[in-house]
């Protein structure tokens, strides 16, 4: 898939920034706001941001520019530059208010059919588990295979470099076709098939990708928020996997939640399956030592481990993946809509 160009975005932050540069008032306000970075730190929800008056004024001036409301795309070129602009402008919109974080990513749903030739899988034993089958589907696709090998190499060996491994994981989940990436990670296993569950848990090479000692979850979030890409992915996840009511129904479509979830893999906030026997997921962090922020920490942790929206989205995608290999399909070759999902 070609990477989205700026022009395909409704209002790319890169384009909006160029427009702003052409206007002296906007340009000066943007530069001033950019220099306010250190004084407007990202507060924790429990903290009140303190904003200098001149920063407030610069923010006010930017509120009428096309920068307000500009967006980025998960697969665009210069994504990090776009996100840098987004978060600078975001300060103008929310003035450091943590609760007002909005995903920087524009929603684009691809409806391009994804062709799969299941007849190529006849080299596998008929009773092979589905995680093995989805891994084989990836191997049979040049792009998926190349990207998977790249992160496999970066994440293996006793002396793997975690930051290199994470970068390759990010690249895989960004550039591999979404159905391949989702099939690989969200493959269904029979309840007692520990081998399949182990394969699924090891998909993201947790021994290298995850921290050897679990950090505090709030510290992990602080670290994530200091990086525009990680912050963007976390906010995107919180936007699209947000359980909106007492029964935890997804605020947006399940497919958007899953895309946001996969977008976290390779960032500091990389989640994973917690065991071989079920589909529970969690961050690799702890709330021990959180002091009077224990409850806040548990709520952050719970956004992954106790999130009914995410749980249902994963379960629905796994049911869908099971159906791909059921006997209901009339032909060995068929097309699956890339955005198809149960809701």
């Amino acid at each position: 898939d070609p990477l989205p160009t700026e022009s395909r975005l409704m209002n790319s932050c890169l384009q909006a920034r160029r427009k702003c540069q052409a206007d002296p008032t906007c340009s000066a306000a943007y530069h001033h706001l950019d220099s306010c970075t250190s004084s407007i730190s990202t507060p924790l929800p429990s903290e009140e941001p303190s904003v200098p008056a001149d920063c407030l004024e610069a923010a006010q001036q930017l509120r009428n520019s096309s920068l307000i409301g500009c967006m980025c795309h998960r697969r665009m070129k210069n994504q990090v530059a776009c996100l840098d602009i987004y978060w600078t402008v975001h300060r103008a919109r929310s003035l450091g208010n943590y609760e007002l974080d909005v995903s920087p990513y524009e929603d684009t749903v691809t409806s391009k059919p994804w062709k799969m030739n299941l007849s190529k899988l006849n080299m596998l034993k008929p009773d092979s588990d589905l995680c093995l089958k989805f891994a084989m589907l990836c191997t049979l696709n040049d792009k998926c295979d190349r990207l998977r090998k790249a992160y496999g190499e970066a994440c293996s060996g006793p002396h793997c470099q975690r930051h290199v491994c994470l970068r390759q994981l990010l690249t895989f989940f960004e550039k591999a076709a979404e159905p391949h990436a989702q099939g690989l990670l969200l493959c269904p296993c029979a309840p007692n098939d520990r081998g399949c569950g182990e394969r699924r848990r090891n998909t993201i090479a947790p021994n290298c990708a995850l921290p050897p000692v679990a950090p505090n979850c709030l510290e992990l979030r602080r670290l994530c928020f200091s990086d525009p890409l990680c912050r963007s992915r976390l906010v995107d996840f919180q936007t699209h996997c947000h359980p909106m009511d007492i029964l935890g129904t997804c605020a947006t479509e399940q497919s958007r939640c899953l895309r946001a979830y996969l977008g976290l893999i390779g960032t500091a906030m990389t989640p994973n399956f917690v065991s071989n026997v079920n589909t529970s997921v969690a961050l690799s962090c702890t709330c021990r030592g959180s002091g009077n922020l224990q409850e806040e920490c548990e709520m952050l942790e719970g956004f992954f481990s106790h999130n009914p929206c995410l749980t249902e989205a994963i379960a629905a995608k796994m049911r869908f993946h099971s159906q791909l290999f059921s006997q209901d399909w009339p032909h060995p070759t068929f097309a699956v809509m890339a955005h198809q999902n149960e809701n």
Partner: antibody, heavy 124, light 107 residues
Amino acid sequence: EVQLVESGGGLVQPGESLRLSCAASGFTFSNYAMSWVRQAPGKGLEWVSVISGSGGSTYYADSVKGRFTMSRDNSKNTLYLQMNSLRAEDTAVYYCAKPPSRAARYFNYGMDVWGQGTTVTVSS
Amino acid sequence: AIRMTQSPSSVSASVGDRVTITCRASQGISSWLAWYQQKPGKAPKLLIYAASSLQSGVPSRFSGSGSGTDFTLTISSLQPEDFATYYCQQANSFPFTFGGGTKVEIK
């Protein structure tokens, strides 16, 4: 320590009203959805109602709909159950309960802290 | 409303026995099922949530399984403190409903 303490139970006649309270401590009350569950003497558990953290959403069991009203005062960390038009079949121990802190806003993961219960007897 | 049917209604067992309690929902509830233990005069205690996840502080001899309509609570080796009444509860849709309970008694 997380604690829920119910009060307000007592003996009333059919058709009368009663208001139960549940005082919460040890957690940020306004973050949590809350629930009332009751248990008639010698019988099983029956869910009564639930309220969102803000108090904006409430849901009721069919058996109490239109007669019971659940509310909360987040400034006082207190949950209420206003029971009107009471019937003999409302006789029960009433418990308030909260969901786990990792799932504070919804009840999909059960109720991990319960009060000790308050007894309501409706009899003529 | 979703009906939750628990069986058996009572079971007599000895310390060390394996005890299995089942709960059936009248319609699919995904994995949104909780199990509680209640002793006379006490409030219920959460044992299992989301069908199979063990609540913090609950002994590992308790386990839950199932999804959709059929669920199981298993006590692998019954201990003296496990003699109590056990309830399942669906948390998939309103109104929430409990099973009728299973009393585990000393044989």
